[in-house]
């Protein structure tokens, strides 16, 4: 058993049917010595008397808010949450597995640049009695500061019969140098509590590996005289690290017909313009990627050919 | 159709072309190592990220773009002295800081070259003959060092009398390649920045 925060305790259980559970001793936070009784949640049934209460915690019915009283007056509370260990591995019931890039990927994180600012998000099908708390650091043995905001509900979507809720959090490394070569990963820890169930989720990454630039901006077409060709031009996204000659991007220009089945023409360039053939009803899209370290491509920025 | 990327004119800044080749070569070598050594801890998540140049060179700081020198988090100044007679900038004026930056890059390359050559000698003794260093990568390191053209004492190749532990050597190879790839990215960024200056 360990303290999550004041008066909130987590009981770790090896979780399987008919498991013996854990014996827990609760102590009433009071100078009083006698006349103390204990109750659980809203029930008025007296579970025991005395300054301490010993309970066998096996199932969720044994968790909850234990209160000690004296003469009708509340002396203190202890909220017990359960953390299930299933075959040696902590349970992951609260969050939805995003399964990308591998099974048991619950947290996904992205950074728009090398400033040390990043966003993480996760999914759940649970809509009520749910709280999250996020902590982060650079490295774990001698952690350096990363400040995270509060997790907020960022999207709701319907998936089949289920509603899916997306939560996200923004974090900023306290003293980040965009040009630094990372040797210690960023660690993100999310505590999740649903009713009386506690779970924790972690993700470890280097900022360089979660970079996903914003799409190129100001995408424009300039028809070339007496030709079906057009000059496509664009600019670096505002959110990208500067100077651009140091933090360079590479670009992919795509000409896509109206039908998804039509052949796509693609050109790769380090410049911020390209000459392509603009077909009728086609659209031109451009996306960006770090020129020197191949992390994710940005989303596409698109303009119609007409 | 996939059209090739147009490469910038290497005449503008001879080192830019070499540094791009370096990044390509080390990335290919790292990919090859990860595939060949799939039963060894060779992924970014599994290895310890060690920097053999730590406390010996300060490439990131010495080569910091002017725009980032206002960022206090980037000014982790280290006292390191460098030889300052680089010729990479051809006819351009080589400022003291630029020479410091380029000589730091040269020292990095020299250190990695020695480590890789020592390691290759060990790997050649491995009866499994599982993996060797790509000669192209070693050649590209050499070319960039020649383009940088710094005079510096030759570091003797480390020789070891004891029987090599091939498992440890292969893990060390992975660690070195990961670190060298990150340094190659920095070198490429620096050359691109200097080319634009």
């Amino acid at each position: 058993i360990w303290e999550l925060k004041k008066d909130v305790y987590v009981v770790e259980l090896d979780w399987y049917p008919d498991a013996p559970g854990e014996m827990v001793v609760l102590t009433c936070d009071t100078p009083e010595e006698d006349g103390i009784t204990w109750t659980l949640d809203q029930s008025s049934e007296v579970l025991g008397s005395g300054k301490t209460l010993t309970i066998q915690v096996k199932e969720f019915g044994d968790a909850g808010q234990y209160t000690c009283h004296k003469g009708g007056e509340v002396l203190s509370h202890s909220l017990l949450l359960l953390h299930k260990k299933e075959d040696g591995i902590w349970s992951t019931d609260i969050l939805k597995d995003q399964k990308e890039p591998k099974n048991k990927t619950f947290l996904r994180c992205e950074a728009k640049n090398y400033s040390g600012r990043f966003t993480c998000w996760w999914l759940t099908t649970i809509s009520t009695d749910l709280t999250f708390s996020v902590k982060s650091s650079r490295g774990s043995s001698d952690p350096q500061g990363v400040t995270c905001g509060a997790a907020t509900l960022s999207a709701e979507r319907v998936r089949g019969d289920n509603k899916e809720y997306e939560y996200s959090v923004e974090c900023q490394e306290d003293s980040a140098c965009p040009a630094a070569e990372e040797s210690l990963p960023i660690e993100v820890m999310v505590d999740a509590v649903h009713k009386l169930k506690y779970e924790n989720y972690t993700s470890s990454f280097f900022i360089r590996d979660i970079i996903k630039p914003d799409p190129p901006k100001n995408l424009q077409l300039k028809p070339l005289k007496n030709s079906r060709q057009v000059e496509v031009s664009w600019e670096y996204p505002d959110t990208w690290s500067t100077p651009h000659s140091y933090f360079s991007l590479t670009f992919c220009v795509q000409v896509q017909g109206k039908s998804k089945r039509e052949k796509k023409d693609r050109v790769f360039t380090d410049k911020t313009s390209a000459t392509v053939i603009c077909r009728k009803n086609a659209s031109i899209s451009v996306r960006a990627q770090d020129r020197y370290y191949s992390s994710s491509w940005s989303e596409w920025a698109s303009v119609p050919c007409s | 159709r996939n059209l090739p990327v147009a490469t910038p004119d290497p005449g503008m800044f001879p080192c830019l072309h070499h540094s791009q080749n370096l990044l390509r070569a080390v990335s290919n070598m790292l990919q090859k190592a990860r595939q060949t050594l799939e039963f060894y801890p060779c992924t970014s998540e599994e290895i310890d990220h060690e920097d053999i140049t730590k406390d010996k060179t300060s490439t990131v700081e010495a080569c910091l773009p002017l725009e980032l020198t206002k960022n206090e988090s980037c000014l982790n100044s280290r006292e390191t002295s460098f030889i300052t007679n680089g010729s990479c900038l051809a006819s351009r004026k080589t400022s003291f800081m630029m020479a410091l930056c380029l000589s730091s890059i040269y020292e990095d390359l020299k250190m990695y070259q020695v480590e890789f050559k020592t390691m290759n000698a060990k790997l050649l003794m491995d009866p499994k003959r599982q993996i060797f260093l790509d000669q192209n990568m070693l050649a590209v390191i050499d070319e960039l060092m020649q383009a940088l053209n710094f005079n510096s004492e030759t570091v003797p190749q480390k020789s070891s009398l004891e029987e090599p532990d091939f498992y440890k050597t292969k893990i060390k190879l992975c660690i070195l390649l990961h670190a060298f790839r990150i340094r190659a990215v920095t070198i490429d960024r620096v050359m691109s920045y200097l080319n634009a200056s």
């Epitope: 399987y16 008919d18 289920n162 | -």
Partner: antibody, heavy 115, light 112 residues
Framework: QVQLVESGGGVVQPGRSLRLSCAAS????????MHWVRQAPGKGLEWVAF????????YYADSVKGRFTISRDNSKNTLYLQMNSLRAEDTAVYYC????????WGQGTMVTVSS | QSVLTQPPSVSGAPGQRVTISCSGS????????VKWYQQLPGTAPKLLIY???QRPSGVPDRFSGSKSGTSASLAITGLQAEDEADYYC????????????FGTGTKVTVLA
């Protein structure tokens, strides 16, 4: 005590479907993840699928992905395996089992896919 | 295709000690716990060992498990006729968890 009873097995032609059930009793079914495991005649054990407590996370072996669907009805204390596009190589005894360091297995139900 | 390798068969006379090995890799046995099951003909597998070396109540102390690096082993001391069965190791892989990874299985024969 904990009991798991599989049913729904039988002989079926290739390409057809079958739905297996696993009735659970003696424990709080809704609190435990559940697996399906199969064993072809004379062969070893092969994991098929897993479902977490509320059914939001499901996992499948590559050999059955896209053809089999694991589901559960916690109000009925029952685990299901919907098997579509059955093949001869799906012939096996199918077991359901609880997830945990101490697990409980059903007695198994035989599925034979044959023309 | 199982990635946990066991010998197809082992045999011993009554009273002897036999061991069954289970060989994996860093991503499975190297990073997860191991279980051992006994399966008698026509019956469901029965748990013998969990958490590498722990015996559930009711399992005789003749059965013991151990794990070292990327391999695990099950030892049966004082072999008895009723120990003749198939034995399977089981673990997880850190990349595919919660998929159960079973060993190839070992037939233990008690020599008359």
């Amino acid at each position: 005590q904990v009991q798991l009873v599989e049913s729904g097995g039988g002989v079926v032609q290739p390409g057809r479907s079958l739905r297996l059930s696993c009735a659970a009793s003696g424990f709080t079914f809704s609190s435990y993840g559940m697996h399906w495991v199969r064993q072809a005649p004379g062969k070893g054990l092969e994991w098929v699928a897993f479902i977490e407590v509320d059914g939001s996370n499901k996992y499948y072996a590559d050999s059955v992905k896209g053809r089999f669907t694991i589901s559960r009805d916690n109000s009925k204390n029952t685990l299901y395996l919907q098997m579509n596009s059955l093949r001869a190589e799906d012939t096996a005894v199918y077991y359901c089992k609880t997830h945990g360091s101490h697990d409980n297995w059903g007695q198994g139900t035989m599925v034979t896919v044959s023309s | 295709q199982s990635v946990l390798t066991q010998p197809p068969s082992v045999s011993g006379a009554p009273g002897q000690r036999v061991t069954i090995s289970c060989s994996g890799s860093r991503s499975n046995i190297g990073s997860n716990t191991v279980k051992w099951y006994q399966q008698l003909p026509g019956t469901a597998p029965k748990l013998l060992i969990y958490y590498n070396d722990q015996r559930p109540s009711g399992v005789p102390d003749r059965f013991s498990g151990s794990k070292s690096g990327t391999s695990a082993s099950l030892a049966i001391t004082g072999l008895q006729a009723e120990d003749e069965a198939d034995y399977y190791c089981q673990s997880y892989d850190r990349y595919t968890h919660p998929a159960l990874l079973f060993g190839t299985g070992t037939k233990v024969t008690v020599l008359a």
